[in-house]
């Protein structure tokens, strides 16, 4: 069952997904000049069994020098056109482990993909919150939303997570200070990324990720 | 709940132009494609376009290619279709719908083209 | 691009029979993006089904959804006088996104 909308926004904060529940979708988009090999697939998604989740299809993208179907509808300034440069860098990573049985791992870079990774969750599935560079995050309660259905329709549990704005940052463990706004868009478009591509999931954070990731960040 | 609520009816003379407004409230806007589709009188359904608001880049069926622009405004949470030198068989009702799997829909415009 | 075929074109049946409606894609590979619609006249398309088996918000439990591969049914299982409507087909799987040409399900 899929999630009807997205994680809830926290002002000054961006959230992401450490593993991705079997059937969760990702879009399947292209950077500008770019458009999806002719009828390539539009999304890919996380499937398995007992054993494995893997990715199935694969993002495709390709010069749309060519006359074809995809369109620029307006102009981007230079430093949106391209992910950050950590992102595309970062090592492959294999899709066909998961560290948490039914999920699966970040899909690793394509070529050309887009500024934006656009994922479809489902029931279930849980995402993290941080602060943006330059909050401070104060927490009543867990910092992360959960999926739920409830009489037959979904929605996200609220986190527990104000962002201050001090010069100090809550920070993904492992991961370096984010950028306060990703490849300079506005605050008011941040609140919401996953900007994922270049996290590696760890393997001694998965155990214990389900229950009290991140407290030794709030305490 | 997210809704869609579109502009209303026109009548066009063949050869003009005609822009259809789709106003979502009540969820994300800009992360989620919104879709175009078609139905002239006693027709099926066809797939015009789509745009994903926050890429601010639009697809489109070959056969509207040179025809229509699909455009978003993040600010109003509003989508755009436009559809250019207008002729007769273009006399539709005109949906935009949220998501690849259509949910949910506007409640439909009607383009009238006659001269 | 993906054409899917529906059938039959026409359905007469009564209500509290059970309807299958089928639909047939030229390519596989599209059975987690195979939706189902009802359309009624005047009204925009409702969905119903999407992921060839997921029942989308507020449908009753007697419209299910199955297939994989190339093949996909859409069943209802004890028709009520409301179900009778025109059901669609779509595959989002690639683009072009692409409908059937529908079915038309009437009272006998």
């Known amino acids: 069952e899929l999630c009807d909308d997205d994680p809830p926004e926290i002002p000054h904060a961006t959230f992401k997904a450490m593993a991705y529940k079997e059937g969760t979708m990702l879009n399947c988009e292209c950077k500008r000049g770019f458009r999806r090999i002719k009828s390539g697939s539009l999304y890919m998604l996380c499937t398995g069994n007992s054993s494995h989740s893997s990715w199935d299809n694969q993002c495709q993208c390709t010069s749309s020098a060519t006359r074809n179907t995809t369109k620029q509808v307006t102009p981007q300034p230079e430093e949106q056109k391209e992910r950050k440069t950590t992102e595309m860098q970062s090592p492959m990573q294999p899709v066909d482990q998961a560290s948490l049985p039914g999920h699966c791992r970040e899909p690793p870079p394509w070529e050309n993909e887009a500024t934006e990774r656009i994922y479809h969750f489902v029931v279930g599935q849980m995402v993290y919150y941080q602060c943006v560079q330059g909050y401070r995050a104060l927490h009543r309660g867990p910092a992360e939303s959960v999926c739920k259905m409830t009489h037959g329709k979904t929605r996200w549990t609220q986190p527990q997570l104000i962002c201050t704005g001090e010069m100090e940052t809550s920070q993904f463990p492992g991961e370096e200070k984010p950028q306060a706004s990703p490849e300079g868009r506005p605050e008011s478009e941040t609140s919401c990324l996953v900007t994922t591509t270049d996290f590696q999931i760890q393997t001694e954070m998965a155990a214990t990720m389900e229950t009290s990731i991140f407290t030794t960040e709030y305490q | 709940q997210v809704q869609l609520v579109q502009s209303g009816a026109e009548v066009k003379k063949p050869g003009s132009s005609v822009k259809v407004s789709c106003k979502a409230s009540?969820?994300?806007?800009?992360?989620?494609?919104i879709n175009w589709v078609r139905q002239a009188p006693g027709q099926g359904l066809e797939w015009m376009g789509r745009?994903?608001?926050?890429?601010?880049?639009?697809d489109y069926a070959q056969k509207f290619q040179d025809r229509v622009t699909i455009t978003a405004d993040k600010s109003t949470n509003t989508a755009y279709m436009e559809l250019s030198s207008l002729r007769s068989e273009d006399t539709a009702v005109y949906y935009c719908?949220?998501?690849?799997?259509?949910?949910?829909w506007g409640q439909g415009t009607l383009v009238t083209v006659s001269s | 691009e993906n054409v899917l075929t529906q059938s039959p074109g026409t359905l007469s049946l009564s209500p509290g029979e059970r309807a299958t409606l089928s639909c047939r894609a030229s390519?596989?590979?599209?059975?987690?993006?195979l939706a189902w619609y009802q359309q009624k006249p005047g009204q925009a398309p409702r969905l119903l089904i999407y992921?060839?088996?997921s029942r989308a918000t507020g449908i009753p439990d007697r419209f299910s959804g199955s297939g994989s591969g190339t093949d996909f049914t859409l069943t209802i299982s004890r028709l009520e006088p409301e179900d009778f409507a025109v059901y669609y087909c779509?595959?989002?799987?690639?683009?072009?996104?692409?409908f059937g040409q529908g079915t038309r399900l009437e009272i006998k």
């Open positions: 719908a949220r998501k690849d799997w259509f949910d949910p």
């Open positions: 009540g969820g994300t806007f800009s992360r989620y494609a």
């Open positions: 745009i994903i608001p926050i890429l601010d880049i639009a």
């Open positions: 390519q596989s590979g599209s059975s987690s993006y």
């Open positions: 992921g060839a088996s």
């Open positions: 779509q595959q989002y799987g690639s683009s072009p996104i692409t």
